[in-house]
């Protein structure tokens, strides 16, 4: 007779990443008895919520419940019913909601309130919805990739379990690009972190880490594009704007009200006597790059060295995992290979941006035009941000690894967030007091 399989002793956790452009739900699973081991939690599901980011629901909060339904129902299906009540659900909102809160705390609270009420209706253990700080977003992204890469494990292995593993315990830096913000987080080499706001101290698995992190609000790819357009229309003073960041032959009408809707364009705002203007693409990488650089103020630095806008940045150290939009954009452009040099990436971008729009539409017929039209800008922006913003060089470029998933789990802040909130990263190596949430932030 066949033995009956013993019921799995596993646990689940759900994290919703409420980003500026969309919301994604992640389901994580781990063996219950190995909670404090490193590398045991893995992602079993990702569900992308149809529609925009939650900050866009400010005028239609009543639609939030329906918006979240499909993915929450998917979670109900994936997680065994017996586990529902003990499965924690966390929602973390990032820069899109940070921007909304800057405009109106009341409106941001209203959105979060409706989100909380909607999520409370499900049979899971809802733990709350909150806007996480940029510092947390950077820190949790760093924790995620290093946890998945096995960097917190004290056991040095003679074999490599992940493609990026270098068999040493040197942590990877984390580069995260969203729609509204971008984060850089790494352990500097014997360098004092000159600005306290950018310093984090962790004790994880018995080891101390002094981590540098900064989140640049308004420098996610979507908000950077709005900034660039607002800057350019100010200089152009014209109803038509030739834009080197869009393909030759591309045309798009932009509403001035949309342009000035975001706090990110406030510094460029001027009274324009027209309600709309037309972008005409001219597809020139070099000129696009030049135009993007004007968004980075590098003339002011009160520290020994800065990234841009007067923000301290220590000398880059070690390898970096570049994920989220860094990965999605570079993957689309077929530039994620470790073998592709920075010079080659630049060459490819020059060719790509110069391709006529009609040709691009034909070559990528399955891609939504809204996204397709912005890859020239996004790719150029990534290069500008990494090279001029963060001071990577042609040589240090090879230390950037564009990562989508590690061991089947998405690189991003959500896993680190859940590990922390469920106390699954102990401060000490043996079974000991777990790290409290307040230790982080």
């Amino acid at each position: 007779t066949q033995n009956k399989a013993l019921p799995e002793n596993v646990k689940y956790g759900i994290v919703l990443d409420a980003g500026s452009s969309h919301t994604s739900l992640y389901i994580y699973k781990w063996p219950a008895e190995k909670e404090n081991d490193t590398g045991v939690v893995h992602q079993v599901e990702e569900c992308r919520v149809k529609g925009p980011g939650i900050s866009k629901f400010v005028q239609k909060v009543n639609e939030i419940g329906i918006y979240l339904t499909d993915c929450m129902e998917r979670a109900r299906e994936v997680i065994p019913r017996s586990q529902h009540q003990e499965t924690p659900v966390y929602l973390g909102a990032t820069a899109g909601m940070r921007l909304l809160r800057m405009e109106s705390e009341e409106l941001a609270d209203r959105v979060l309130d409706v989100v909380e009420r909607s999520l409370s209706n499900y049979p899971f253990d809802f733990q709350g919805a909150r806007i996480i700080t940029g510092q947390e977003e950077g820190a949790y992204g760093w924790i995620t990739i290093n946890y998945l890469l096995g960097k917190f494990s004290q056991k040095t292995r003679w074999f490599s379990i992940v493609p990026y593993e270098t068999n040493n315990q040197e942590t990877f830096g984390a580069l995260d690009l969203g729609g509204a913000s971008t984060q850089v987080t790494f352990v500097p080499q014997n360098q004092t972190i000159e600005s306290p706001d950018n310093a984090l101290q962790f004790r994880l698995y018995g080891k101390d880490y002094n981590v540098y992190t900064h989140s640049f609000l308004c420098y996610g790819k979507d908000q950077a594009l709005w900034q660039k357009l607002a800057k350019d229309i100010q200089v152009a003073s014209n109803e038509i704007l030739r834009d080197p960041c869009f393909h030759p032959g591309y045309k798009k009408v932009v509403n001035v009200s949309d342009l000035y809707k975001t706090p990110c364009t406030k510094r460029f705002e001027m009274t324009l006597p027209f309600q709309q203007f037309e972008i005409q693409g001219i597809g020139n990488y070099q000129q696009c790059h030049q135009s993007i650089l004007e968004l980075f103020n590098t003339s002011y630095c009160p520290y020994s060295q800065c990234a841009f806008n007067g923000i301290f940045l220590p000398p880059l150290q070690g390898d970096f995992g570049a994920f989220s939009a860094f990965y999605f954009v570079m993957k689309f452009l077929n530039l994620t290979s470790e073998k592709v040099s920075q010079e080659k990436v630049t060459e490819m971008m020059k060719k790509f941006c110069a391709q006529p729009w009609e040709e691009i539409k034909t070559s990528y017929a399955g891609v939504k035009e809204k996204y397709l039209s912005e890859y020239c800008f996004s790719g150029t922006y990534i290069l500008s941000l990494l090279l001029q913003g963060y001071h990577f060089t042609a040589d240090s470029w090879e230390h950037i690894h564009f990562i989508g998933k590690i061991q089947g789990s998405d690189a991003g802040w959500t896993l680190g967030y859940m590990l922390n909130l469920t106390n699954m990263i102990p401060a000490e190596q043996p079974l000991s007091t777990p790290l409290s949430h307040s230790t982080y932030v």
Epitope: V235, A236, S237, N238, R242, I282, Q287, Q290
Partner: antibody
């Protein structure tokens, strides 16, 4: 081939008026902002006025504000500079130039037309 | 208004010589600067835009550079047709303002 041709210059008495046209060809005139720039004898270039493609944005130099009016007729591909209350210091060569950010900022200029204000 | 201070106001140089003209902006203009050449017959031609981008058809001996608020036009090896007047113009804000000009003469 892009061409800008100014005309209408001449001798005008102080306090008088004159309208300078600039005829454009070889490009989509209605897409471009247009400028008037002048140069007094033996002097440098001086920006005078600007009009956007749809005429919704207009700027003037302080020296001509209230006396000069820039306008355009997109159907006729023509730019105009109406000058009133002319003074001797308005004596100059007047140039028109086209403008379209990013790469066409004052990239083509006319050959100029001479205005002399004297009694 | 943004003042553009151009130097030198005149310059005598020989064929084959390397020359540099400079414009200094009184306020931040973020690279929004063009260089123009005016021939003795009054013809005006744009050479460089966005501080350093060479116009198509302009010889490679011309180059534009930016260092902080200083902008320069360099001609690496003078040719006879380069003797003319040169102007910089900022297009960061209105009113648009020109530098005072540089008269480049043959020595």
């Amino acid at each position: 081939e892009v061409q800008l041709v100014e005309s209408g210059g001449g001798l005008v008495k102080p306090g008088g008026s004159l309208k300078l046209p600039c005829a454009a060809s070889g490009f989509t005139f209605s897409d471009y902002g247009m400028h008037w720039v002048r140069q007094a004898p033996e002097k440098g270039l001086e920006w005078v006025a600007y009009i956007s493609s749809g005429s919704s944005i207009i700027y003037y130099a302080d020296t001509v504000k209230g006396r000069f009016t820039i306008s355009r007729d997109n159907a006729k591909n023509t730019l105009f500079l109406q000058m009133t209350s002319l003074r001797s210091e308005d004596t100059a060569m007047y140039y028109c130039a086209r403008d379209l950010y990013y790469d066409h900022v004052l990239d083509y200029w006319g050959q100029g037309t001479t205005l002399t204000v004297a009694s | 208004d943004i003042q553009m201070t151009q130097s030198p106001s005149s310059l005598s140089a020989s064929l084959g010589e390397r020359v540099s003209l400079t414009c200094r902006a009184s306020q931040e203009i973020s690279g929004y600067l063009i260089w123009l050449q005016q021939k003795p017959d009054g013809t005006i031609k744009r050479l460089i835009y966005a501080a350093s981008t060479l116009d198509s058809g302009v010889p490679k001996r011309f180059s534009g550079n930016r260092s902080g608020s200083d902008y320069s036009l360099t001609i690496s090896s003078l040719e006879s047709e380069d003797f003319a007047d040169y102007y910089c113009l900022q297009y960061a804000s209105y009113p648009r303002t020109f530098g005072g000009g540089t008269k480049l003469e043959i020595k």
